[in-house]
């Protein structure tokens, strides 16, 4: 930022690293909760047509896949990895890909992933081959 730009106090719209650099915000698919046909596949596209500028630069992309007796839904949002989402920590927030991991939720099958490359929650990956620290 040019030197004349005032530094804001207690404002998380502007995230800086130790050198005072400003972080560009993430671009994520952001359709909230939608019905999905994604089932029994190694990977799926979100079919979300909305790409949003995440409000806060520390936010990452998140996808949540849920299946119960009635339907399947896919949720796509931006979220701050310092805060839990659906009561779970976003432990994979630094990943460039959205690798789905199953979480224990009573009465449903629940998978969640987070990632930090642009629109990375558009392609959600269930395949086990990615779940062993695959850098790609």
């Amino acid at each position: 930022i040019p030197p004349h730009v005032q530094k804001s106090v207690n404002n998380d719209m502007m995230v800086t690293d130790n050198n005072g650099a400003v972080k560009f915000p993430q671009l994520c698919k952001f359709c909230d909760v939608r019905f999905s046909t994604c089932d029994n596949q190694k990977s799926c596209l979100s079919n979300c047509s909305i790409t949003s500028i995440c409000e806060k630069p520390q936010e990452v992309c998140v996808a949540v896949w849920r299946k119960n007796d009635e339907n399947i839904t896919l949720e796509t949002v931006c979220h701050d990895p310092k805060l839990p989402y659906h009561d779970f920590i976003l432990e994979d927030a630094a990943s460039p890909k959205c690798i789905m991991k199953e979480k224990k939720k009573p009465g449903e099958t629940f998978f969640m992933c987070s990632c930090s490359s642009d629109e990375c929650n558009d392609n959600i990956i269930f395949s086990e081959e990615y779940n062993t620290s695959n850098p790609d």
Epitope: P2, P3, G20, A21, F24
Partner: nanobody, 124 residues
Framework: EVQLLESGGGLVQPGGSLRLSCAAS???????RMWWVRQAPGKGLEWVS?????????YYADSVKGRFTISRDNSKNTLYLQMNSLRAEDTAVYYC?????????????????WGQGTLVTVSS
């Protein structure tokens, strides 16, 4: 060294329109995603809109969707922001910024990545 220079700011009444421009010197304009960023008095940065270099795909913050339109003319090395239905809360200094592929941070004071800003005041 590429420099970014904004223009088009000014005083406008609520409901009015303004068109901001950002002229980039240098020949690498087409390699960068371009952003409009604003900072209201005493507030932090708000990332308003972005546009891709190829295909010109656009992105908007929720606060300006349907009112602002970003565009670029790569032949003129110029970025634009058409602002309609302006509100008092749009009052801010507006900056253009450029982002290289896979770039996550930009250092303070990099005038080749940030313009000096143009003030937009929405008031009756």
């Amino acid at each position: 060294e590429v420099q970014l220079l904004e223009s088009g700011g000014g005083l406008v009444q609520p409901g009015g329109s303004l068109r901001l421009s950002c002229a980039a010197s240098g020949s690498t304009f087409t390699e960068y995603r371009m952003w409009w960023v604003r900072q209201a008095p005493g507030k932090g940065l708000e990332w308003v809109s972005a546009i891709e270099p190829i295909g010109h795909r656009t992105y908007y913050a929720d606060s300006v969707k349907g009112r602002f339109t970003i565009s670029r003319d790569n032949s003129k090395n110029t970025l634009y922001l058409q602002m309609n239905s302006l509100r008092a809360e749009d009052t801010a200094v507006y900056y253009c910024a450029k982002q290289a592929p896979n770039q996550r941070y930009v250092a303070r004071g990099r005038l080749d990545y940030w313009g000096q800003g143009t003030l937009v005041t929405v008031s009756s």
